[in-house]
């Protein structure tokens, strides 16, 4: 069986402050069963950026229609970017469980924030 791939095609993205940033992520298969989550940073101190099930993420929206069937695009858009948003963002696939188990992470996309043009 082919191993699941989590694909973040851009190594880096540069966005002007105040604009929106699109962070792309696709997976190669619908299975194993389990959710996708986005994080900033790696390791135990990483920050949860988007998880549809839990939390409130007013600045983050999925790029593709969340009701689309059998969709493998888990890209997100972050609005009103500020310098504090800079960092490396990871799209992470989890295997369903109690609790869910991290299965595979994308390679990461580094977000840099440019000063807003005057």
């Amino acid at each position: 069986e082919e191993e699941l791939q989590v694909i973040q095609p851009e190594k880096s993205v540069s966005v002007a402050a105040g604009d929106s940033a699109t962070l792309n992520c696709t997976v190669s298969s619908l299975i194993p069963v389990g959710p996708i989550q986005w994080f900033r940073g790696a390791g135990p101190g990483r920050e949860l950026i988007y998880n549809l099930k839990e939390g409130h993420f007013p600045r983050v929206t999925p790029v593709s229609d969340p009701t689309k069937r059998n969709n493998m695009d888990f890209s997100i858009r972050i609005s009103n970017i500020t310098p504090a948003d800079a960092g490396t963002y990871y799209c992470v696939k989890f295997r369903k469980g109690s609790p869910d188990v991290e299965l595979k992470s994308g390679a990461g996309t580094e977000l840099s924030v440019r000063a807003k043009p005057s």
């Epitope: 069986e1 069963v33 549809l52 009701t67 493998m72 369903k96």
Partner: antibody, heavy 120, light 108 residues
Framework: EVQLLESGGGVVQPGGSLRLSCAAS????????MTWVRQAPGKGLEWVST??????YYADSVKGRFTISRDNSKNTLYLQMNSLRAEDTAVYYC???????????????WGQGTLVTVSS | EIVLTQSPATLSVSPGERATLSCRAS??????LAWYQQKPGQAPRLLIY???IRETGIPARFSGSGSGTEFTLTISSLQSEDFAVYYC??????????FGGGTKVEIK
């Protein structure tokens, strides 16, 4: 056209075993999770088990007794049922999972079911 | 485990009338709810998913609404082929996937 065809049902004594099969066609079988749902006579629907790609999930009522598996080369889903009890008597349906991105699974295609009767 | 309670258990409706079926979840399932129709001797058939989206090929007289813990399946004008048992199913928090106990829509 998606088709799911269950087989392997029948009458078995309490404590006995049975293996159900579900032959799938009309879609890329290996790309989707698959599920077994059962329905006792005159009763409602009860989820039994789901398999992704090696990841398996079971209802508490069958855990340790039933084993779900799949053979992607044969486009076939299986349910091995051991230590059968009278309360396992039901029509067993196999179903293809469909998912809404970011979310969970529901069942968009169902087979016609196979009847399992556990009786002495 | 999330418990789904369907009401009424039986709904007697005349052909051409509107039928309103309820499904209540014991906790918030957001929009992660599906509706199925089952006729005697047949397998269930998917009608609605994501609480409100009609499956391909399902007539427009079927509509789903609600979110959180309260959901409704409405059949705007009952046809003879709509007399059946209807089940809701949540897929927000599993295992286990859970189904409601069903609502039987019968001819008045």
């Amino acid at each position: 056209e998606v088709q799911l065809l269950e087989s392997g049902g029948g009458v078995v004594q309490p404590g006995g075993s049975l293996r159900l099969s579900c032959a799938a066609s009309g879609f890329s079988f290996s790309n989707f999770a698959m599920t077994w749902v059962r329905q006792a006579p005159g009763k409602g629907l009860e989820w039994v088990s789901t398999i992704g790609s090696g990841d398996t999930y079971y209802a508490d009522s069958v855990k340790g007794r039933f084993t779900i598996s799949r053979d992607n080369s044969k486009n076939t889903l299986y349910l091995q049922m051991n230590s059968l009890r009278a309360e396992d008597t039901a029509v067993y349906y196999c179903a293809k999972d469909s998912t809404v991105s970011w979310s969970g699974d529901f069942f968009d295609y169902w087979g016609q079911g196979t009847l399992v009767t556990v009786s002495s | 485990e999330i418990v789904l309670t369907q009401s009424p258990a039986t709904l007697s409706v005349s052909p051409g009338e509107r039928a309103t079926l309820s499904c209540r979840a014991s906790q918030n399932v957001k929009n992660d709810l599906a509706w199925y129709q089952q006729k005697p001797g047949q397998a269930p058939r998917l009608l609605i998913y994501a609480a409100r989206i009609r499956e391909t090929g399902i007539p427009a007289r079927f509509s789903g609404s609600g979110s959180g813990t309260e959901f409704t399946l409405t059949i705007s004008s009952l046809q003879s082929e709509d007399f059946a048992v209807y089940y809701c199913q949540q897929y927000y928090d599993w295992p286990p996937f859970t189904f409601g106990g069903g609502t039987k829509v019968e001819i008045k």
